[in-house]
Interface confidence: medium
Amino acid sequence: CKAMHVAQPAVVLASSRGIASFVCEYASPGKATEVRVTVLRQADSQVTEVCAATYMMGNELTFLDDSICTGTSSGNQVNLTIQGLRAMDTGLYICKVELMYPPPYYLGIGNGTQIYVIDPEPCPDSDF
């Protein structure tokens, strides 16, 4: 495979509801019809897989039913949304793109998006 450039934003702030969205864009050197996108989380020196989806170009991304990720694709861009985030999930989220079909196989790994998650302040009890 040839190296493939993957671009993603450096920093994203999650919403107060624990939702973070970012775009993962890849410069496809081939005419891929089948693409696999994986979101990896790097914390300290540990890298874990957050979610992954395989899709046909022009079709929707399909994550597993219990996945915390959703996404849409448009050309060489994938719009990824990660839900259910809490402060402890703050970290570097890396977009990995693989062009699976047709051969040759291409692999691209982004530099990562630092997602900051701030847990909302609990509402003060109101006395009536």
Partner: antibody, heavy 115, light 111 residues
Framework: QVQLVQSGAEVKKPGASVKVSCKAS????????FTWVRQAPGQGLEWMGW????????DYAQKFEGRVTMTTDTSTTTAYMELRGLKSDDTAMYYC????????WGQGTTVTVSS | QSVLTQPPSVSGAPGQRVTISCTGS?????????VHWYQQLPGTAPKLLIY???SRPSGVPDRFSGSKSGTSPSLAISGLQSEDEADYYC???????????FGSGTKVTVL
């Protein structure tokens, strides 16, 4: 853990066909395709082709085009490679491997072609 | 005859460093396609050792390293151990054959 288990050894006559199976477990089957590679006795590795488990698309090495068929069965998470018109120089160990990157391999299936 | 050429054999004493080259042409390595390396221990299936020229899958010791300087990829094994005795193959895409091609293979012997 991720595992690929292949069918047992086969002995075939010249002109016959052989169908090798590769049962996958430990990962989402449709997320990765299968590469098939063979190795003649005492020789190097030879790429035969690739199949997508996602939609069944195939890409075969020119050498095997018209003689090989690769398929997958999502219901049983199994990949198959059928080679027709066997000749003595098809005697080899046949391997399946996960994905085009071949990050996990089956244990191999010995196919002997002899009259 | 393989499209990618490797030395038939290399050897070294335990603890030494050995390198294996993989030479291709303008339709494969020279065209910029990545090189992957596989290790095949005697009597076993091959195992992915290095992908994308220099990346190591988890579980592969850091004694193994891949590099690609221009059009000359190589695999290095430092701190050679007896369990490294195996055949090593490089792999790249060839755009004229429209197929993946393996190198001829290199047998590593630990003296």
């Amino acid at each position: 853990q991720v595992q690929l288990v292949q069918s047992g050894a086969e002995v075939k006559k010249p002109g016959a066909s052989v169908k090798v199976s590769c049962k996958a477990s430990g990962y989402i089957f449709t997320s990765y395709g299968f590469t098939w590679v063979r190795q003649a006795p005492g020789q190097g590795l030879e790429w035969m082709g690739w199949i997508s488990s996602y939609n069944g698309n195939t890409d075969y090495a020119q050498k095997f085009e018209g003689r090989v068929t690769m398929t997958t069965d999502t219901s049983t998470t199994t990949a198959y490679m059928e080679l027709r018109g066997l000749k003595s120089d098809d005697t080899a160990m046949y391997y399946c491997a996960r994905g085009p990157q071949m990050d996990v391999w089956g244990q191999g299936t010995t196919v002997t072609v002899s009259s | 005859q393989s499209v990618l050429t490797q030395p038939p054999s290399v050897s070294g004493a335990p603890g030494q460093r050995v390198t294996i080259s993989c030479t291709g042409s303008s339709s494969n390595i020279g065209a910029g396609y990545d090189v992957h390396w596989y290790q095949q221990l005697p009597g076993t299936a091959p195992k992915l050792l290095i992908y994308g020229n220099s990346s190591r899958p988890s579980g592969v010791p850091d004694r193994f390293s891949g590099s690609k300087s221009g059009t000359s990829p190589s695999l290095a094994i430092s701190g050679l151990q007896s369990e490294d005795e195996a055949d090593y193959y490089c792999l790249s895409w060839d755009e004229s054959l429209n197929a993946y091609v393996f190198g001829s293979g290199t047998k590593v012997t630990v003296l």
